[in-house]
Interface confidence: medium
């Protein structure tokens, strides 16, 4: 659709085109499977335009249908370690708060690989906080071209 002159002068945030691309900051303390993310121009190619970070977790500020994407590469990994060391390693992305909207959106297992990547379209609401849980004992790489997480507003 074409934008009016007035709309063209508005910041993207006001048009609803919320978007974020994050890089891994750190893993959680013991017994906390969550990955903690960071974003901003000072960090390189990560950014937040609309969504915000709450203690390393991504919080949505605008209702809509979003494309959620994630790639995670294991730093300590091998063709056998994903099955041999302790427990299978699984990545899950979901809405973790508010509790009333808690749901899993993506679930992936590493099996014999060291990298997983996936994306999906899903409705998200203002206040939804997305958590990315890495279960198992293997560690993710913090290389920005190997591990990243983002959302893109697509339509109301």
């Amino acid at each position: 659709q074409r934008l009016s002159r007035a709309q063209q002068q508005l910041p993207l945030e006001s048009l609803g085109w919320d978007i974020a691309e994050l890089q891994l900051n750190h893993t959680g303390p013991q017994q906390d499977p969550r990955l903690y993310w960071q974003g901003g121009p000072a960090l390189g190619r990560s950014f937040l335009r609309g969504p915000e970070l709450d203690k390393g977790q991504l919080r949505i500020r605008r209702d809509g249908i979003y494309m959620v994407h994630i790639q995670v590469t294991l730093a300590i990994c091998s063709s056998t370690s994903t099955s041999r060391h302790h427990h299978p390693t699984t990545l899950a992305v979901g809405i973790c708060s508010p509790a009333s909207r808690s749901i899993s959106l993506l679930r992936l297992s590493f099996h014999q690989g060291c990298t997983i990547a996936s994306q999906r379209l899903t409705p998200l609401a203002r206040g939804d906080t997305l958590c990315t849980n890495l279960t198992g004992t293997l560690l993710p790489s913090r290389n920005t071209d190997e591990t990243f997480f983002g959302v893109q507003w697509v339509r109301p």
Partner: antibody
């Protein structure tokens, strides 16, 4: 300045136990994974064990799995290696090494090492 | 496990010469997760190169790394007296982490 200081080495008989310590300073200890690497006299370097920054994830070389236990006390900035059922082939200089950052496996700083001799 | 083979075992050169050290892996090392260390007698290893080609902090630019897959090279463009030592490669893309057995660089 990053400093790693190992202690606890010595002579022990086969089947015995030792506990190595590595006191760390100059960086936020709890934010970094740590490893133990050993070097037998005149031999190659051999990675022994690694532990995540939180202590929640540990990894071992097959040669020591079930006999050695890596741990850390982040409140004391100290890394440990409990070595049980020691064998002659465990004789080596043991280095503690800091990983480049919390989840990344190469070693950017090493201690000076502590010698463990297993002999009857 | 990935076995790293370093060659030559010993390299005899004079200060000012160029040194080329080789590290070959038994299988491909993902993402060029390979590091080089320098070790002098009685000292701990010192990180020189990580990611196959990135110089560690404070390492002079006469040290350079290259390669990918299974073949990696450490080059010292112009040897200084303090460069004579043992050099180890290490892969960190696979568990267990493994080291080569070293190349001894000695003064000719």
């Amino acid at each position: 300045e990053v400093q790693l200081l190992e202690s606890g080495g010595g002579m022990v008989q086969p089947g015995g136990s030792l506990r190595l310590s590595c006191a760390a300073s100059g960086f936020t200890f709890s934010s970094y994974a740590m490893s133990w690497v050993r070097q037998a006299p005149g031999k190659c370097l051999e990675w022994v064990s690694a532990i995540s920054g939180s202590g929640g994830r540990t990894f071992y070389a097959e040669s020591v799995e079930g006999r050695f236990t890596i741990s850390r006390d982040n409140s004391k900035n100290t890394l440990y290696l409990q070595m049980n059922s020691l064998r002659a082939e465990d004789t080596a200089v043991y280095y503690c090494a800091k990983h480049d950052y919390s989840n990344y496996p190469y070693f950017d700083y090493w201690g000076q090492g502590t010698l463990v001799t297993v002999s009857s | 496990e990935i076995v790293l083979t370093q060659s030559p075992g010993t390299l005899s050169l004079s200060p000012g010469e160029r040194a080329t050290l080789s590290c070959r892996a038994s299988q491909s090392i993902r993402s060029s997760y390979l590091a080089w260390y320098q070790q002098k007698p009685g000292q701990a290893p010192r990180l020189l190169i990580y990611g196959a080609s990135s110089r560690a902090t404070g390492i002079p630019d006469r040290f350079s790394g290259s390669g990918s897959g299974t073949d990696f090279t450490l080059t010292i463009s112009r040897l200084e007296p303090e460069d004579f030592a043992v050099y180890y490669c290490q892969q960190y893309g696979d568990l267990p982490f493994t080291f080569g057995c070293g190349t001894k660089l000695e003064i000719k």
